[in-house]
Amino acid sequence: EDELQVIQPEKSVSVAAGESATLRCAMTSLIPVGPIMWFRGAGAGRELIYNQKEGHFPRVTTVSELTKRNNLDFSISISNITPADAGTYYCVKFRKGSPDDVEFKSGAGTELSVRAKPS
């Protein structure tokens, strides 16, 4: 059986300060059941970048409409990039659990580097 794969096609993305960065992520299956989230960094200290269900992420928009049915595209765009946004971003599939969802599979990561704003 083909297990779900998390595909982050770009290993790295370079964006000028002040511009928007698009971080691409796709799944190969809708199962197992559970949400998808984006993080910067790995391990216990990672920073949550986007979770559709909870939280407020004013600089993040989803590439696909949130009412799209059976969506397999979980790419995001982060606006007004600053040097502080540099780092490696991971698209992570969670498996529904009780009471807490459990990490199931992560993408390989996309390293975001920030260029100086053109003068």
Epitope: L30, I31, K68, N70, R95
Partner: antibody
Framework: EVQLVESGGGVVQPGGSLRLSCAAS????????VSWVRQAPGKGLEWVST??????YYADSVKGRFTISRDNSKNTLYLQMNSLRAEDTAVYYC???????????????WGQGTLVTVSS | EIVLTQSPATLSVSPGERVTLSCRAS??????IAWYQQKPGQAPRLLIY???SRDTGIPARFSGSGSGTDFTLTISSLQSEDFGVYYC??????????FGGGTKVEIK
């Protein structure tokens, strides 16, 4: 065209067992979650169970008695029902899950249902 | 468990009338509500998902609205084929998926 066809219903005594099947066609069965929803005579809808890949979820009322499974090579969903009770009497519907956004499931296609009657 | 309360339980309506069905959740479910129609002897049919998105092939006279805890299904001009029972379902927090008790729309 999406089709879900249930079978296996019938009359069974309390404490007995029954296995329901749902044959699916018209969609990529292996990448979708699928569920069982039941409806007692003259009553409303009650969710019973959902299966994703090998992840399974059950209503408290059937936990430990019912087992959901799937065979992706046959595009078929199953519900093994043991220790049946009178209150399990219902039409059992197989339903294809649909997701919206990044999380959240509802049921976009339903079979016509199979009647399970638990009676002595 | 999130409880969905539908009102009224029964609605007697004449064809051509506007119909408003209510579904109230016991806690915030954001916009994670679906609506189904069920006719006697038939399986439920999806009408609306994400509170306000019509399923493919559903006539424009059906519309959904609301977010948080209060949701409405509106049929702008009831047709004879619209009679039946309507159920709301939440998928914000599960298991279990929960359904409302249903609203029966019958001919006046």
């Amino acid at each position: 065209e999406v089709q879900l066809v249930e079978s296996g219903g019938g009359v069974v005594q309390p404490g007995g067992s029954l296995r329901l099947s749902c044959a699916a066609s018209g969609f990529s069965f292996s990448i979708y979650a699928v569920s069982w929803v039941r409806q007692a005579p003259g009553k409303g809808l009650e969710w019973v169970s959902t299966i994703g890949a090998d992840d399974t979820y059950y209503a408290d009322s059937v936990k430990g008695r019912f087992t959901i499974s799937r065979d992706n090579s046959k595009n078929t969903l199953y519900l093994q029902m043991n220790s049946l009770r009178a209150e399990d009497t219902a039409v059992y519907y197989c339903a294809k899950d649909s997701t919206v956004g990044w999380s959240g499931d509802f049921f976009d296609y339903w079979g016509q249902g199979t009647l399970v009657t638990v009676s002595s | 468990e999130i409880v969905l309360t539908q009102s009224p339980a029964t609605l007697s309506v004449s064809p051509g009338e506007r119909v408003t069905l209510s579904c109230r959740a016991s806690q915030n479910v954001r916009s994670d509500i679906a609506w189904y129609q069920q006719k006697p002897g038939q399986a439920p049919r999806l009408l609306i998902y994400a509170a306000s998105s019509r399923d493919t092939g559903i006539p424009a006279r059906f519309s959904g609205s609301g977010s948080g805890t209060d949701f409405t299904l509106t049929i702008s001009s009831l047709q004879s084929e619209d009679f039946g029972v309507y159920y709301c379902q939440q998928y914000y927090d599960w298991p279990p998926f929960t359904f409302g008790g249903g609203t029966k729309v019958e001919i006046k």
